[in-house]
Amino acid sequence: KRFHDVLGNERPSAYMREHNQLNGWSSDENDWNEKLYPVWKRGDMRWKNSWKGGRVQAVLTSDSPALVGSNITFAVNLIFPRCQKEDANGNIVYEKNCRNEAGLSADPYVYNWTAWSEDSDGENGTGQSHHNVFPDGKPFPHHPGWRRWNFIYVFHTLGQYFQKLGRCSVRVSVNTANVTLGPQLMEVTVYRRHGRAYVPIAQVKDVYVVTDQIPVFVTMFQKNDRNSSDETFLKDLPIMFDVLIHDPSHFLNYSTINYKWSFGDNTGLFVSTNHTVNHTYVLNGTFSLNLTVKAAAPGPCPPPPPPPRPSKPTPSLGPAGDNPLELSRIPDENCQINRYGHFQATITIVEGILEVNIIQMTDVLMPVPWPESSLIDFVVTCQGSIPTEVCTIISDPTCEITQNTVCSPVDVDEMCLLTVRRTFNGSGTYCVNLTLGDDTSLALTSTLISVPDRDPASPLRMAN
């Protein structure tokens, strides 16, 4: 059997011949050693017994989408049946005091591969034997501690495969310079050691995407905005736009990135090299936000222009390598290509509470029977829309340990002047956070307040 017979043939194997090879990967036309690595179809009854105590699940993730030319990293994590885990030696053991359907196990090991490898014979002095090989016959690399690596992962994409020895979690990075744009499929088959052979335990596949567009995401933040994810913001307060470029392999680290903004409110284009920008909308309504990101990224060099035809034959210029016209074909050459990314959003601008201020605090005189608590009136003004709710959070003087939170609907006239009355149990210094809210906004003000003892002579005062 060949690799493409075993690993699924999502694409014709001729695909690889039409594409440059992925660095370090091999053609899936190669032969697969079925004696060492048996192949089971989906639904084969042997899968049920491929792992002691249940099925192993493989989870494949990637940091897709990847900008063409950058590296994409795939990670596979094995999830073992309940109560099982991999120990420091790579053996699979039962977790202490963990009860599964079979109850507590007397044997601490699910698989004691250390014991197996010590018992195994037929190895030469290098620790190499005919069974410490991958499905294509290549020997295992002898990294320090390789004996503790008991899983074999075979990655397959674009008519090519990559083999890796590992523990319960592995990562593989692939450069996408030679990968066709668009969605691609990565398949992974996982084997475990089984004496001098291997047993399949899991198969998993995942779609990844290679794109020539810079993957761009914009976060938007505005003070007093109640819900930053609904793309509704407040008039007359700056919105901070922060551009996040998805570049996990740092492909664009040395690129100059330009950001071109159109806020959709007839304020024109704004060009910047900073990934954050502030903008204030001064009218209510719906606006179309557009961002274009431009980066000069490493890319393929253009083919050289054809040499001018000489009018009469000229003597040879010597080997092709000496010909300056051939330089652009040198693969290590540092050519740049402009890559672009786009982001578009429709944002709604509404009235909101712009500001809240405590302008006065008054100690409300109370009858004698309640000397241990104080009633304080906070006179509050606000600007912007009419609040519907007031919340007070009373905490310790550091404003960190909340003692009491009270929220209630509030009736405010168009002048936006209101009085909030709150109870303070005992004297001392308190931090008071007061928020006024409506459907779209939440405005906060804070103050430190010093509540005196119940001696009528001691006045209420704002601390500091």
Epitope: N404, V406, S408, D438
Partner: antibody, heavy 116, light 111 residues
């Protein structure tokens, strides 16, 4: 002068529906929260629901949550209470009231009778 | 069973001073304004006191409200026969997220 006028009450069978209206005048309706309060025959006052000036915030008593819906049309200066899955214990005079942290003006009420 | 507790009845003779109490908790009376409503027989309720002790215009100064901790009270001085009515206290409850009323106090003016 502030005026609140309820309508839409009447006799309805258990499980039935009714929609109450409250026409407001004499103040800037769109700037004020509004509420519904009810009073069963011979009993005390029970708050039912409140709505913010814009209609974005709504509050309901546990006894009506999921069955009653408060709404408003600021262009018509009208407050509504849609009552579904009515029960015998919903029988009461329903008052429309202005504001929600205190009820400073009340309508005269409309009687809702739920009976088979 | 009301969240706010009022005596079911109170009485007094004309000219007397009568006090009606209303007891609650820190989530309602303790940290929110108390209002008092008067309901004359066969009519809609009317706001008598708001913000614990404030009188709307048109309400005589014979009516006064006060609050102490988690209790509030309504005092009526110089009692008159037209004061015979049901009186309700009310406040927003921040824990229940609901407006709560007392069960009401029926005031009888004797003689």
């Amino acid at each position: 002068e502030v005026q609140l006028l309820e309508s839409g009450g009447g006799l309805v069978q258990p499980g039935g529906s009714l929609r109450l209206s409250c026409a407001a005048s004499g103040f800037t309706f769109a700037a004020r929260p509004m509420s519904w309060v009810r009073q069963a025959p011979g009993k005390g006052l029970e708050w039912v629901s409140s709505i913010s000036h814009s209609g974005g915030s709504k509050y309901y008593a546990d006894s009506v949550k999921g069955r009653f819906t408060i709404s408003r049309d600021n262009s018509k200066n009208t407050l509504y209470l849609q009552m579904n899955s009515l029960r015998a214990e919903d029988t009461a005079v329903y008052y429309c009231a202005r504001k929600w942290s205190t009820f400073d003006y009340w309508g005269q009420g409309t009687l809702v009778t739920v009976s088979s | 069973q009301s969240v706010l507790t009022q005596p079911p009845s109170a009485s007094g003779t004309p000219g007397q001073r009568v006090t009606i109490s209303c007891s609650g908790s820190s989530s309602n009376i303790g940290n929110n304004y108390v209002s008092w409503y008067q309901q004359l027989p066969g009519t809609a309720p009317k706001l008598l006191i708001y913000a614990d002790s404030q009188r709307p215009s048109g309400v005589p100064d014979r009516f006064s409200g006060s609050k102490s901790g988690t209790s509030a009270s309504l005092a009526i001085s110089g009692l008159r026969s037209e004061d015979e009515a049901d009186y309700y206290c009310g406040a927003w409850d921040s824990s229940l997220n609901a407006y709560v009323f007392g069960g009401g106090t029926k005031l009888t003016v004797l003689g």
